[in-house]
Amino acid sequence: SGTTNTVAAYNLTWKSTNFKTILEWEPKPVNQVYTVQISTKSGDWKSKCFYTTDTECDLTDEIVKDVKQTYLARVFSYPAGNVESTGSAGEPLYENSPEFTPYLETNLGQPTIQSFEQVGTKVNVTVEDERTLVRRNNTFLSLRDVFGKDLIYTLYYWKSSSSGKKTAKTNTNEFLIDVDKGENYCFSVQAVIPSRTVNRKSTDSPVECMGQEKGEFREI
């Protein structure tokens, strides 16, 4: 049903990384425009992206209010130039999104190795604690602030001269590993939320190797 020449949106998909959250859908509009609404399970609908010809809508500002809530969105279709027109049921055509719980589902962004420091046969590798768009008390929270003990990092490291990788894990943003004296090592890290069933791991960070600017070497 619906107004002539108006088609309902379909393939509604949440795209979310570190809580930056965009709803995408199809089709590209032809003689129609869209408005998006978002709600928590128990809340009121809030309209966003009014009468847009885009096929995406940034809902970050809404979901960061409580990333542990479960959200539902819907996309309304209106005839271009006649947005008051409604479908045969007395309201515009719309399609619902899947439910989305940011805390459980947002993708983990690619982490960055902030620094590494060698002291003798130990290397301390520090992962950058990336800022999210989630706020508390007017300050932006870091990924660690939001995920706390649920977030771990896995370090992959190997001698520059070989391909055999070792791994280490940390519940903080720092690793302290043993290395062989006189050898250069390369490092890559991955963010992991072990308790998840989906989107458990980030992509690997860019590789950083000893002997490059990012690190510091101290022989003791």
Epitope: T101, L104, L141
Partner: antibody, heavy 121, light 109 residues
């Protein structure tokens, strides 16, 4: 308002199993860890383990592996703990608790009223 | 398993400031231990006071504050009141499990 309502007291025979429930209201059940805690007179508080209802992920205190089993029903917003092969050592008050809002504050923010389990022949 | 140690009992007077501490057998307590403080009043009434070292729980009065003092976690009650008489438990997170302290019985005379 966040509330955790636990099931009533149980009198059990040694060797039996008991299942305690913890009904959550006032928040998104799937996104918060539910903690289970044991209290015995003279023994203080012992952490049994935790479950994240949205993923059914669990962690157990080594001491309670094989003794306690956690489940959660997201349709009824209820967490369960089953205790098996009961002995007198299992006689205690058992609590469920919910963690805080964000990660830097994980732990034991809201508590149920407790369920007394008595094991006696 | 780590052992978490608290003062067994402390006494204070109304209006005074009192600090309860929580020591870990594995070394210094850090923010990665997500120190929690829980209050138990008679009839098994538990209330979360502090989570994550220094974050006050919902509805908890401002006189309760959490911090790290030296190598220990601390709960400070600034201007204790008679209704603060209770048992206070701390709990520390160790990578994949929580450990509770034995509790501090606080008397407010």
């Amino acid at each position: 308002e966040v509330q955790l309502q636990q099931s009533g007291a149980e009198l059990m025979k040694p060797g039996a199993s008991v299942k305690i429930s913890c009904k959550a209201t006032g928040y998104t059940f799937s996104s918060y860890w539910i903690e289970w805690v044991k209290q015995r007179p003279g023994h203080g508080l012992e952490w049994i383990g935790e479950i994240l209802p949205g993923s059914a992920s669990t962690k157990y205190n080594e001491k309670f592996k094989g003794k306690a089993t956690f489940t959660a029903d997201t349709s009824s917003n209820t967490a369960y703990m089953q205790l098996s092969s009961l002995t007198s050592e299992d006689s205690a008050v058992y609590y469920c608790a919910r963690d805080y809002y964000y990660g830097s504050s994980y732990g034991f923010a809201y508590w149920g009223q407790g369920t007394l389990v008595t094991v006696s022949s | 398993q780590a052992v978490v140690t608290q003062e067994s009992a402390l006494t204070t007077s109304p209006g005074e400031t009192v600090t309860l501490t929580c020591r870990s057998s594995t070394g210094a307590v850090t923010t990665s231990n997500y120190a929690n403080w829980v209050q138990e009043k008679p009839d098994h009434l538990f209330t979360g006071l502090i989570g994550g070292t220094n974050n006050r729980g919902p509805g908890v009065p401002a006189r309760f504050s959490g911090s790290l003092i030296g190598d220990k976690a601390a709960l400070t009650i600034t201007g204790a009141q008679t209704e603060d008489e209770a048992v206070y438990f701390c709990a520390l997170w160790y990578s994949n499990h929580w450990v509770f302290g034995g509790g501090t019985k606080l008397t407010v005379l």
